[in-house]
């Protein structure tokens, strides 16, 4: 008996060939011996089965001895053994129809779980193997669960259902709603304008929701809201902005915030939260601001940084074109009685300069 696997909603063709390449009488029946379709004279006739309105045959191939049955818009309950009667012989084809669907909306927030459920005919024992767009392989039986979706899980998932050494492939498009980056750090000299950008890792035709940037300044005892906003069809409108600092926000996506100037009291870390309408949960992106200040006061040249820096970062004071350097894995370095000239303050990570500020030391007479 031949086994054919089909996909719910799809079309399947069950083949039946006569030994002689000519038009002859044939019938397709189900396991209950109920006629589905056949030939009478030169015409296709249909029997009283449930399939009659969805079953057809390729008339153009009859004179070649091909008497296939095409079933459209497959249902799980179409799974059955079908019998083709031609030239006094019977050919049996077992059709197994499977369906694979996501248990919820296919637009899911990062961190949420995805469950794929396999619909299968009674008595079957299929196995399912799914491959994510990022190459992650997940195996299961009737259900496949991905407990925590990541950004890279966005895209087309390819799932293969296997039964009796036969396979059928399903493709499911999953959109993971997330920001492109989980975290970003902006390094700025004191007084410079700061640009924060929060690009999304997905596109939706209608994007509506609301959000807030909540900020914990390093020098502040508690965190506070810097800005709240609404998003209506990709248009951004500010709801409330704190008076200090007075942030500005772009009216279009990607979400874009401008801090007029970087000051030590603003250095710290923030969390931009975005709630999308009709979605449970929220999108988050962490943003850090590191501010550098180089100052000369009397005989002391100081360079300081504020904000979240890793302990492995190096802060250096260096006299241009000279070897004089002082370096520390600290948030402040200083030189007493510095030589006259252009000094550079550098914040670096394994030799890569993240931030620099120049200060001119004039000779004291």
């Amino acid at each position: 008996k031949k086994v054919v696997l089909g996909k719910k909603g799809d079309t399947v063709e069950l083949t039946c060939n006569a030994s002689q390449k000519k038009n002859t009488q044939f019938h397709w029946k189900n396991s209950n011996q109920i006629k589905i379709l056949g030939i009478q004279g030169l015409f296709l006739t249909k029997g009283p089965s449930k399939l009659s309105d969805r079953a057809d045959s390729r008339k153009s191939l009859w004179d070649q001895g091909c008497f296939s049955m095409i079933i459209k818009n497959l249902k799980i309950e179409d799974s059955d053994t079908y019998i083709c009667e031609v030239e006094n012989k019977k050919e049996e084809v077992e059709l197994l129809v499977f369906g694979l669907t996501a248990n919820s909306d296919t637009h899911l927030l990062e961190g949420q779980s995805l469950t794929l459920t396999l619909e299968s005919p009674p008595g079957s024992s299929p196995s399912v193997k799914c491959r994510s767009p990022g190459g992650k392989n997940i195996q299961g039986g009737r259900t496949i669960s991905v407990p925590q979706l990541e950004r890279q899980d966005s895209g087309t998932w390819t799932c293969t259902v296997s039964q009796d050494q036969k396979t059928v492939e399903f493709k499911i498009d999953i959109v993971v709603l997330a920001f492109q980056k989980a975290s970003s750090t902006v390094y700025k000299k004191e007084g410079e304008q700061v640009e924060f950008s929060f690009p999304l890792a997905f596109t939706l035709e209608k994007l509506t929701g609301s959000g807030e940037l909540w900020w914990q300044a390093e020098r502040a005892s508690s965190s506070k809201s810097w800005i709240t906003f609404d998003l209506k069809n990709k248009e951004v409108s500010v709801k409330r902005v704190t008076q200090d600092p007075k942030l500005q926000m772009g009216k279009k996506l990607p979400l874009h915030l401008t801090l007029p100037q970087a000051l030590p009291q603003y250095a710290g870390s923030g969390n931009l939260t975005l709630a999308l309408e009709a979605k449970t949960g929220k999108l988050h992106q962490e943003v850090n601001l590191v501010v550098m200040r180089a100052t000369q006061f009397q005989e002391n040249l100081t360079c300081e940084v504020w904000g979240p820096t890793s302990p492995k970062l190096t802060l250096s004071l260096k006299l241009e074109n000279k070897g004089a350097t002082v370096s520390k894995q600290a948030k402040a370095v200083w030189v007493l009685n510095p030589e006259a000239g252009m000094w550079q303050c550098l914040l670096s990570d394994s030799g890569q300069v993240l931030l620099e500020s120049n200060i001119k030391v004039v000779p004291t007479w």
């Epitope: 609301s210 807030e212 609404d230």
Partner: antibody, heavy 119, light 106 residues
Framework: EVQLVESGGGLVQPGGSLRLSCAAS????????MSWVRQAPGKGLEWVAN????????YYVDSVKGRFTISRDNAKNSLYLQMNSLRAEDTAVYYC????????????WGQGTLVTVSS | IQMTQSPSSVSASVGDRVTITCRAS??????LAWYQQKPGKAPKLLIY???SLQSGVPSSFSGSGSGTDFTLTINSLQPEDFATYYC?????????FGQGTKVAIK
Amino acid sequence: EVQLVESGGGLVQPGGSLRLSCAASGFTFSSYWMSWVRQAPGKGLEWVANINEDGSEKYYVDSVKGRFTISRDNAKNSLYLQMNSLRAEDTAVYYCVREGGQWLALDYWGQGTLVTVSS
Amino acid sequence: IQMTQSPSSVSASVGDRVTITCRASQGISSWLAWYQQKPGKAPKLLIYAASSLQSGVPSSFSGSGSGTDFTLTINSLQPEDFATYYCQQANSFPWTFGQGTKVAIK
């Protein structure tokens, strides 16, 4: 520790005036919007008014517009509610509230002061 | 914006799951908070942004919804949870509260 302490409540005749005060401590008062919320005896909560950090923006519920004035003195860490032309329906416990929660939530509340308008 | 809470009161036992709904007369996105008030005390913030738990609030409390329909769920009612609960919108002025739901001991 954030603390909000209301004062100035009491018994007043219809048409009379009263000034409520709220002393704030434990946070940078000048960095937050503040609100007044009231609750009539045995009834639900009703937001009355709010004011931004420097006092340049003020909003009121329709039923008190033109009669109540919200103000603040950041130097004194104080919030005020001047209530004029008082009516019997203004009888309530008045709460001083900080709008410091995430997503504009009202995160800290005073213990309330009772205002009774009766002849 | 009018906020309508239901039910206005509910009788429940310790360990029960209690669900309170709040409906806004127009869309308020996620600008919704839930408060708990005990007799003679000031209200206390439980949930902000429709579903985010305020720091220090037990995880037995949860919120959901966006737009016009919102829900507060108390998963396993504790003796200290018998109180009145209010929803409040912060989408547009004037801020408005629901009429309250009293959770009483059965």
